[in-house]
Amino acid sequence: TQHGIRLPLRSGLGGAPLGLRLPRETDEEPEEPGRRGSFVEMVDNLRGKSGQGYYVEMTVGSPPQTLNILVDTGSSNFAVGAAPHPFLHRYYQRQLSSTYRDLRKGVYVPYTQGKWEGELGTDLVSIPHGPNVTVRANIAAITESDKFFINGSNWEGILGLAYAEIARPDDSLEPFFDSLVKQTHVPNLFSLQLCGAGFPLNQSEVLASVGGSMIIGGIDHSLYTGSLWYTPIRREWYYEVIIVRVEINGQDLKMDCKEYNYDKSIVDSGTTNLRLPKKVFEAAVKSIKAASSTEKFPDGFWLGEQLVCWQAGTTPWNIFPVISLYLMGEVTNQSFRITILPQQYLRPVEDVATSQDDCYKFAISQSSTGTVMGAVIMEGFYVVFDRARKRIGFAVSACHVHDEFRTAAVEGPFVTLDMEDCGYNIPQTDESTLMTGRA
């Protein structure tokens, strides 16, 4: 059994600068960028866990101020704590940076629950365990927040890696990754390997353990097994994709595929759960319950509220089904599927269990804003955000948690007709009505 224990994060990686300095062809993403250079400095540069987010170390300002920043593919602002807050160990002090420039503009971001607000500016930003470059980027200095920072999460800001269309206050505020690509020779691509531990980690264990890797500008072949399969990015706002079929233990949910993408389907590292539209969630839970009917769990468990506990080491993984999401492929009428295990969608919870118990929350939940493929999905896979070619790649992660009987999988091709019909066309509304609400 692979428990997902990983080596401690290397704090001082030496070595030559990354071999990513080749000029980019305008329309051409480098052929398999992972072969172009060494990504050793970026491997294992994430820490954290699905319940509280994965973060990367970044430096801001001159002299550099080091902060831990949540990696979020579901938003597009680079925003950092810039005032004292009970849950922050440190924060960005603009007055200490000689390179800070005030944009004299405020920004307010409301969530379904909670919010943050701040002041916009620019400063010099770099990623110590990333490409050897420094960029001037927009920064939202968070001066006030409610239910945004998480006690004990160890991150002080958020790196929104999605597109300008969903940036706040509007799409004229260039996101960090756009600035990075414009100002450097870093290819327009990044990849994420999020590594769930498979068991609860306390605070000190999280600090000492590896949460995964964010490879900026390329693909690292050591982080996945098998082949990468790509699905088109439907629209460049969120990382929107199209799901064409859903199976529970190989049994088709048999719903109109539009339901799976109502009103969108996105890949979002800043969300914990796999979130499904109401109708799809109800059908999926019904099917999961049926598949695991030898045991019965409380209603609150399926709502993601109550924890179910088993004596340590006796979790009956075999009674829970695998879940397969079929994604639109790059070729007409071709799809591929990604399959996750209960080891991904049952999330270990710390602090409640005794050493005699393993306790879990059901990490699939209902959504009113479409499907969200959050950390519990991403923890099964190495995910390539190939912005240059407007596609997202999935391969089985080298660090995913599994057992001796089953493993996560990425398989294809499958013949699927009329996949374009699976996309939902959202009626045009004022962008300011968008609410970001993520569990």
């Epitope: 045991e295 769990f297 409380p298 609150g300 506990c309 409640v352 118990d357």
Partner: antibody
Framework: QLQLQESGPGLVKPSETLSLTCTVS??????????WGWIRQPPGKGLEWIGS???????YYNPSLKSRVTISVDTSKNQFSLKLSSVTAADTAVYYC????????????WGRGTLVTVSS | EIVLTQSPATLSLSPGERATLSCRAS??????LAWYQQKPGQAPRLLIY???KRATGIPARFSGSGSGTDFTLTISSLEPEDFAVYYC??????????FGGGTKVEIK
């Protein structure tokens, strides 16, 4: 209406096995809406959960008692049973059987209880 | 492990008075908490579940409140039959197994 009734010997010798049965009447033990559980209460003390069982036979036990406890179900007789091995005086208690309802979370219906004394 | 602490251990009141019983969890149990009443020589009886919902047949004078770590059982006006021991139980972690130590409500 549904009722639960515990039965079994009131006196058990130390080191022997305590055996109790709970008979469910007025309803089916095979309902998918309930678990069935055993709880005990030493004289003058509080309540201690022993374990629970589903009609399929799936069981959950209190970790502190797990090595000594077996709970089983007989759907044909509408009964579930408790066996507690290697008993000592500390196992002297009133033993209750109960239904776990309200979203399979709370003990919403209890038997009257039976006192089991462990003594030589 | 989640520990439930009930206070006071004993509450001495007269019929007609208001009784306020407390149950504190060592960490949040959301609203997954129940209250049981146990009279001498009898089995416990479910009074309140999900912190504030009255079980079938329970008089309106019994009410539950709270969420997270602090919970209260209130008996608005004590009847003679209400003098008993009251237990809280959390089911945030399942299977249900953790009870508080009990509060005895006795006649003053």
């Amino acid at each position: 209406q549904l009722q639960l009734q515990e039965s079994g010997p009131g006196l058990v010798k130390p080191s022997e096995t305590l055996s109790l049965t709970c008979t469910v009447s007025g309803g089916s033990i095979s309902s998918s809406s309930y678990y069935w559980g055993w709880i005990r209460q030493p004289p003058g003390k509080g309540l201690e959960w022993i374990g629970s069982i589903y009609y399929s036979g799936s069981t959950y036990y209190n970790p502190s008692l797990k090595s000594r406890v077996t709970i089983s179900v007989d759907t044909s007789k509408n009964q579930f049973s408790l066996k507690l091995s290697s008993v000592t005086a500390a196992d002297t208690a009133v033993y209750y059987c109960a239904r776990v309802g309200h979203g399979i979370s709370y003990f919403d219906l209890w038997g009257r209880g039976t006192l089991v004394t462990v003594s030589s | 492990e989640i520990v439930l602490t009930q206070s006071p251990a004993t509450l001495s009141l007269s019929p007609g008075e208001r009784a306020t019983l407390s149950c504190r969890a060592s960490q949040s149990v959301s609203s997954y908490l129940a209250w049981y009443q146990q009279k001498p020589g009898q089995a416990p009886r479910l009074l309140i579940y999900d912190a504030s919902k009255r079980a079938t047949g329970i008089p309106a004078r019994f009410s539950g409140s709270g969420s997270g770590t602090d919970f209260t059982l209130t008996i608005s006006s004590l009847e003679p039959e209400d003098f008993a021991v009251y237990y809280c139980q959390q089911v945030y972690t399942w299977p249900p197994r953790t009870f508080g130590g009990g509060t005895k409500v006795e006649i003053k």
